[in-house]
């Protein structure tokens, strides 16, 4: 489901996220700030003047500036969230929609090589949709998803860097690779 005017927001599985309301400043005129999770049309948090702040469960926290914190993101937190703000006269002064998408963070990529086959492999084990980039002495060699295999033809002594990234994280590994002329492991 795609909402065209939604703020695209990415969060990492297991981490906290703050849904900040852009261009909103809290003032005395604000009476009501209500957050909804739209898939089940359920109110999840609400601030009302002179009333106790409501939160549907402890994983939600509502700050005085209207920001909603969701703690320890789970896959079912991926949803469309709506915040509605009303003034003391009951007028809807602001409405924002957040399209929260969740990815698992990438793990540190593992670089391994064999001098016999003159082949280097970079692999990332965890993470949603990781993209890998391989560099040799600072020069970009290739990019791929999840696994990169690189074969060389000459004797090799070089520094390889492999970077794994997705929308919520990025991790790198660096390995100095040295192979003798004859190709011994």
């Amino acid at each position: 489901k795609e909402i065209t005017n939604a703020l695209e927001t990415w969060g990492a599985l297991g981490q906290d996220i703050n849904l900040d309301i852009p261009s909103f400043q809290m003032s005395d005129d604000i009476d009501d700030i209500k957050w909804e999770k739209t898939s089940d049309k359920k109110k999840i948090a609400q601030f009302r003047k002179e009333k106790e702040t409501f939160k549907e469960k402890d994983t939600y926290k509502l700050f005085k500036n209207g920001t909603l914190k969701i703690k320890h993101l789970k896959t079912d937190d991926q949803d469309i969230y709506k915040v509605s703000i009303y003034d003391t006269k009951g007028k809807n002064v602001l409405e924002k929609i957040f399209d929260l998408k969740i990815q698992e963070r990438v793990s540190k990529p593992k670089i391994s090589w064999t001098c016999i086959n003159t082949t280097l492999t970079c692999e990332v084990m965890n993470g949603t949709d990781p993209e890998l980039n391989l560099y040799q002495d600072g020069k970009h060699l290739k990019l791929s998803q999840r696994v990169i295999t690189h074969k060389w033809t000459t004797s090799l002594s070089a520094k390889f860097k492999c970077t794994a990234g997705n929308k919520v994280s990025k991790e790198s590994s660096v390995e100095p690779v040295s192979c003798p002329e004859k190709g011994l492991d």
Epitope: L7, E8, E131, H140, L143, G165, N166, K167, K170
Partner: antibody, heavy 120, light 106 residues
């Protein structure tokens, strides 16, 4: 809702430098690379380089390594590209665009472009 | 990687089915993206990874190919499709674009 806002025009003197800006909104700024692309009048597109707001990692087209420097201000969700020692060849429209870190070579959304005119 | 597009210009009639060609100087697997640029506008992404559709792009646009030969097809051209179409190498750096195919109405 995704927006990449660029100033419309910049008039600069030959030999001087210019710092182009690209203000992002409507998405998680640190989830996407910011790319810079040059387009001379009635000509094709030329990739200058890119920067990752997550950690300020940069990649440049070798042709522009001594000409362009990309920087980031995450507090204002703004990317900058400084072009130095400008000649008439630098007169062009400069676009910023974003590419997702998990499929980072497709330029998914573009700014309106800044027309840079190098003239004395 | 050098990207070569053909033809340079294509004159069409609304309703035509057209094919635009793009060739890479070496194999780039399916790391090929297509853009449309209308007059006085910014480019916009039409197709990514040779054949993957983009949200908001009309279904008449489709892409095919792998390796070094790629095709962008428009199955029934509309007047608003006039513009320049660019293919882009997304396989290795520097990212490179073709010179473009200009689509005009006959």
């Amino acid at each position: 809702q995704v927006q990449l806002q660029q100033p419309g025009t910049e008039l600069v003197r030959p030999g001087s430098s210019v710092k182009l800006s690209c203000k992002a909104s409507g998405y998680t700024f640190t989830s996407y690379w910011v790319n810079w692309v040059k387009q001379r009048p009635d000509q094709g597109l030329e990739w200058i380089g890119r920067i990752d707001p997550y950690d300020s990692e940069t990649h440049y087209n070798q042709k522009f390594t001594d000409k362009a420097i990309s920087t980031i201000d995450t507090s204002s969700n703004t990317a900058y590209m400084q072009l130095s020692t400008l000649t008439s060849d630098a007169s062009a429209v400069y676009y910023c665009s974003r590419s997702p870190r998990d499929s980072s070579t497709n330029l998914a959304d573009w700014g309106q472009g800044t027309l840079v005119t190098v003239s004395s | 990687i050098v990207m070569t597009q053909s033809p340079a210009t294509l004159s069409v009639t609304p309703g035509d089915r057209v094919s635009l060609s793009c060739r890479a100087s070496q194999s780039i697997s399916d790391y090929l993206h297509w853009y449309q640029q209308k007059s006085h506008e910014s480019p916009r992404l039409l197709i990514k990874y040779a054949s993957q559709s983009i949200s908001g792009i009309p279904s008449r646009f489709s892409g095919s190919g792998s390796g070094s030969d790629f095709t962008l097809s428009i199955n029934s051209v509309e007047p608003e499709d006039v513009g320049v179409y660019y293919c882009q190498n997304g396989h290795s750096f520097p990212l490179t674009f073709g010179a473009g195919t200009k689509l005009e109405l006959r």
